[in-house]
């Protein structure tokens, strides 16, 4: 048993049929010695008396808010949560496996630049009685500070019969140098509590590996005289690290017909313009990627050819 | 159509082209190592990230772009040099700061070159003959060092009398390649920045 926060405790349980329960001794936080009784949750029934209560925790029915009282007055509370371990593996019932980039990916994180700011998100089908708490650091043995905000519900989607909820959190490394070469990964830890179930999820990454630039901005077409060709120009996204000559991007320019089956023409360039043939009803899209470290491509920025 | 990026004009900043070749070569070598050594811990998640140049050179700090010198986190509580305008020891007068940056890059390359050559000698002794260092990568390191045109003491190749542990050598190779790739990215950024200056 360990303390998650004040008056909230996590009991770690081996979850197999013939596992013995965990013996827990609850102590009433009071100088009083006599006349103390204990209750659980909304029930007014007395479960025991005395300054301590020894219980066996084996089921979710044994978890909950234990309260000690004296003469009708509440003295203190202890909320017990359960963390299940099945076949030596901690349960992951609360969050959905996103399976990208690999199986057992519950947290996904992205950064728009090298400033040390990043966003993580996760999915669940649970809509109520759910809380998240996020902590992060650079390295684990001698951790350096990363500050994370509160996790918020960022999207709701319908997937077949189920509703899916996306939560996200923004974090910022306390003293980040965009030019630094990372040798210690960022660690992100999410505590998830659903009713009386506790789970924790972790992700470890280097900022350089989760970079995904915003799409190029100000995408414009300039027709070339007496030609089917157009000059496409764009700019670096505002959110990209500066100076751009140091943090350079490379670009992919794509000409796509109306039909998805039509052949796509693609050009790769380090410049912020390119000359392409603009077909009728086609659209031109441009995306960006770090020129020197191949992490994710940005989403496409698009303009119609017309 | 997949059109490759155009190569820089010969008249451009002389080291840019070499640094781009270096990054390409080390990235290819790392990819080859990860495929060949698929049952070894060779991915970024599995290896320990060690920097053999740590406390010996200070390339990141010495080559910091002017715009980032206002960022206290980049100064890392050291006496930091930063690069100003100039070229890769070409005809224009090179500032002291810039020379410090480029000499730091040169020292990095020299250290990695020695490590890679020592490692290759060990790998050539492996009866499995599983993996060797790409000669192209070693050549590209050499070319960039020549372009930087520094004269410094030649570091003797490390020789070891004991029987090599090939498993450990291959893991060390992965660690070295990951670290060198990160340094090659920094070098490329620096050269790109200098080219624009």
């Amino acid at each position: 048993i360990w303390e998650l926060k004040k008056d909230v405790y996590v009991v770690e349980l081996d979850w197999y049929p013939d596992a013995p329960g965990e013996m827990v001794v609850l102590t009433c936080d009071t100088p009083e010695e006599d006349g103390i009784t204990w209750t659980l949750d909304q029930s007014s029934e007395v479960l025991g008396s005395g300054k301590t209560l020894t219980i066996q925790v084996k089921e979710f029915g044994d978890a909950g808010q234990y309260t000690c009282h004296k003469g009708g007055e509440v003295l203190s509370h202890s909320l017990l949560l359960l963390h299940k371990k099945e076949d030596g593996i901690w349960s992951t019932d609360i969050l959905k496996d996103q399976k990208e980039p690999k199986n057992k990916t519950f947290l996904r994180c992205e950064a728009k630049n090298y400033s040390g700011r990043f966003t993580c998100w996760w999915l669940t089908t649970i809509s109520t009685d759910l809380t998240f708490s996020v902590k992060s650091s650079r390295g684990s043995s001698d951790p350096q500070g990363v500050t994370c905000g509160a996790a918020t519900l960022s999207a709701e989607r319908v997937r077949g019969d189920n509703k899916e909820y996306e939560y996200s959190v923004e974090c910022q490394e306390d003293s980040a140098c965009p030019a630094a070469e990372e040798s210690l990964p960022i660690e992100v830890m999410v505590d998830a509590v659903h009713k009386l179930k506790y789970e924790n999820y972790t992700s470890s990454f280097f900022i350089r590996d989760i970079i995904k630039p915003d799409p190029p901005k100000n995408l414009q077409l300039k027709p070339l005289k007496n030609s089917r060709q157009v000059e496409v120009s764009w700019e670096y996204p505002d959110t990209w690290s500066t100076p751009h000559s140091y943090f350079s991007l490379t670009f992919c320019v794509q000409v796509q017909g109306k039909s998805k089956r039509e052949k796509k023409d693609r050009v790769f360039t380090d410049k912020t313009s390119a000359t392409v043939i603009c077909r009728k009803n086609a659209s031109i899209s441009v995306r960006a990627q770090d020129r020197y470290y191949s992490s994710s491509w940005s989403e496409w920025a698009s303009v119609p050819c017309s | 159509r997949n059109l490759p990026v155009a190569t820089p004009d010969p008249g451009m900043f002389p080291c840019l082209h070499h640094s781009q070749n270096l990054l390409r070569a080390v990235s290819n070598m790392l990819q080859k190592a990860r495929q060949t050594l698929e049952f070894y811990p060779c991915t970024s998640e599995e290896i320990d990230h060690e920097d053999i140049t740590k406390d010996k050179t200070s390339t990141v700090e010495a080559c910091l772009p002017l715009e980032l010198t206002k960022n206290e986190s980049c100064l890392n509580s050291r006496e930091t040099s930063f690069i100003t305008n100039g070229s890769c020891l070409a005809s224009r007068k090179t500032s002291f700061m810039m020379a410090l940056c480029l000499s730091s890059i040169y020292e990095d390359l020299k250290m990695y070159q020695v490590e890679f050559k020592t490692m290759n000698a060990k790998l050539l002794m492996d009866p499995k003959r599983q993996i060797f260092l790409d000669q192209n990568m070693l050549a590209v390191i050499d070319e960039l060092m020549q372009a930087l045109n520094f004269n410094s003491e030649t570091v003797p190749q490390k020789s070891s009398l004991e029987e090599p542990d090939f498993y450990k050598t291959k893991i060390k190779l992965c660690i070295l390649l990951h670290a060198f790739r990160i340094r090659a990215v920094t070098i490329d950024r620096v050269m790109s920045y200098l080219n624009a200056s």
Epitope: D41, Q42, I55, Q56, G61, D62 | -
Partner: antibody, heavy 119, light 107 residues
Framework: EVQLVQSGAEVKKPGESLKISCQSS????????IGWVRQMPGQGLEWIGI????????RYNPMFRGQVTMSVDKSSSTAYLQWSSLKASDTAMYYC????????????WGQGTMVTVSS | EIVLTQSPATLSASPGERATISCRAS??????LAWYQQKPGQAPRSLIY???NLQSGIPARFSGSGSGTDFTLTISSLEPEDFAVYYC?????????FGQGTRLEIK
């Protein structure tokens, strides 16, 4: 006052189905799991299993798994034990009981339902 | 599963006497053992839980002791209403199991 009131005695033929009930009152139904115990004529007590009234989480005694089904209706604070195809060997007194949280034993019991299966 | 063996199977005693019933587990159950009383035609009633804790409303003449594998239920001075069948139950490991019962009869 805590009370567990069970449905009346049943006489059934082999192969028939049956569902007996246990209605709880006088306490917070969702705080306490409900269990079932069998007592064959002239015999001792046998633990069938327990279930959560909150989310129908169930723990069966392997000996009874597949033989009986436990269920619960939160809205009426009622627990059920059912058989899809009775056998003569199911003849017994069945007790529902309230599981004490933080312990696991049964602190309050229903009066029992006698089930007789005979052709 | 854990087997609980009660002894004796039948105990003859007179009102006012002290009665002791033993319950032995085939493996340790810690302190997670309860005692129940069952009278003819009635449901069992909880007497003792966690080996030695008296259930609310049960007279103080009933007491329990033991831990691990050996447990004892003691009735310090028998009253006429105490003559019944007594069962021990372990609730440490699933499936929870009962002893075969001890019949306490009037001598």
């Amino acid at each position: 006052e805590v009370q567990l009131v069970q449905s009346g005695a049943e006489v059934k033929k082999p192969g028939e189905s049956l569902k007996i009930s246990c209605q709880s009152s006088g306490y917070s139904f969702t705080t306490y799991w409900i269990g079932w115990v069998r007592q064959m004529p002239g015999q001792g007590l046998e633990w069938i299993g327990i279930m959560s009234p909150v989310d129908s989480d169930i723990r069966y005694n392997p000996m009874f798994r597949g033989q009986v089904t436990m269920s619960v209706d939160k809205s009426s604070s009622t627990a059920y034990l059912q058989w899809s195809s009775l056998k003569a060997s199911d003849t017994a007194m069945y007790y529902c009981a309230r599981r004490r949280p933080g312990q696991g034993y049964f602190d309050f019991w229903g009066q029992g339902t006698m089930v007789t299966v005979s052709s | 599963e854990i087997v609980l063996t009660q002894s004796p199977a039948t105990l003859s005693a007179s009102p006012g006497e002290r009665a002791t019933i033993s319950c032995r587990a085939s493996q340790s159950v810690g302190s997670w053992l309860a005692w129940y009383q069952q009278k003819p035609g009635q449901a069992p009633r909880s007497l003792i839980y966690a080996a030695s804790n008296l259930q609310s409303g049960i007279p103080a003449r009933f007491s329990g002791s033991g831990s691990g594998t050996d447990f004892t239920l003691t009735i310090s001075s028998l009253e006429p209403e105490d003559f019944a069948v007594y069962y021990c139950q372990q609730y440490n490991i699933y499936p929870y199991t009962f002893g075969q019962g001890t019949r306490l009869e009037i001598k």
